[in-house]
Interface confidence: medium
């Protein structure tokens, strides 16, 4: 069966404020085993921040990261 080598971190709450975009280095999606979906942003200082994937700014940051591939 399909099994992905993705991080197993889960988001139990989301950041309440928008992170400045220039702080963001990368992102990944939380595991399907988590109780709620989440995007985890990795900052340039190696901090992980949980964000709500339905928020517009989160989708914009993800799109911009994809664009920089």
């Amino acid at each position: 069966s399909l099994a992905a080598d993705t991080p197993t971190a889960c988001c139990f709450s989301y950041t309440s404020r928008q992170i400045p975009q220039n702080f963001i280095a990368d992102y990944f999606e939380t595991s399907s085993q988590c109780s709620k979906p989440g995007v985890i942003f990795l900052t340039k200082r190696s901090r992980q921040v949980c964000a709500d994937p339905s928020e517009e700014w989160v989708q914009k940051y993800v799109s911009d990261l994809e664009l920089s591939a």
């Epitope: 069966s1 992905a4 999606e29 939380t30 399907s32 979906p37 989708q59 990261l65």
Partner: nanobody, 123 residues
Framework: EVQLVESGGGLVQAGDSLRLACAAS????????MGWFRQAPGKEREFVGA????????YYADSVKGRFTISKDNAKNTVYLQMNSLKPEDTAVYYC????????????????WGQGTQVTVSS
């Protein structure tokens, strides 16, 4: 064994719409991204769009943005590519793929591929 099967291709007129489907069996989509790629005659395979399964985040190539939409049906383990306002330059074999790419456009990070379905757009 994971299998991806595309369907819905065909011959249409410029300006028409078409919906492609990608049905998966032998596994689940969880933690995978589902991508759509296409290959026109004599050209390299290129990224069309993709969806991250859990968050439903989508990303599209500039050439199809605003015209193509990817969606999914959890119950049917199926991903759809809705193609509107088709152009002759959209003519290609369309492939769906599953994988864990760090970036959705990274074609070589998709582990599983379908056999493709032909889409022909006539002017």
């Amino acid at each position: 064994e994971v299998q991806l099967v595309e369907s819905g291709g065909g011959l249409v007129q410029a300006g028409d719409s078409l919906r492609l489907a990608c049905a998966a069996s032998g596994g689940t989509f969880s933690n995978y991204a589902m991508g759509w790629f296409r290959q026109a005659p004599g050209k390299e395979r290129e990224f069309v769009g993709a969806l991250r399964w859990i968050t439903r985040i989508t990303y599209y190539a500039d050439s199809v943005k605003g015209r193509f939409t990817i969606s999914k049906d959890n119950a049917k383990n199926t991903v759809y590519l809705q193609m509107n306002s088709l152009k002759p330059e959209d003519t290609a074999v369309y492939y769906c793929a599953a994988g864990s790419p760090s970036r959705l456009v990274n074609m070589n990070q998709y582990n599983y591929w379908g056999q493709g379905t032909q889409v022909t757009v006539s002017s």
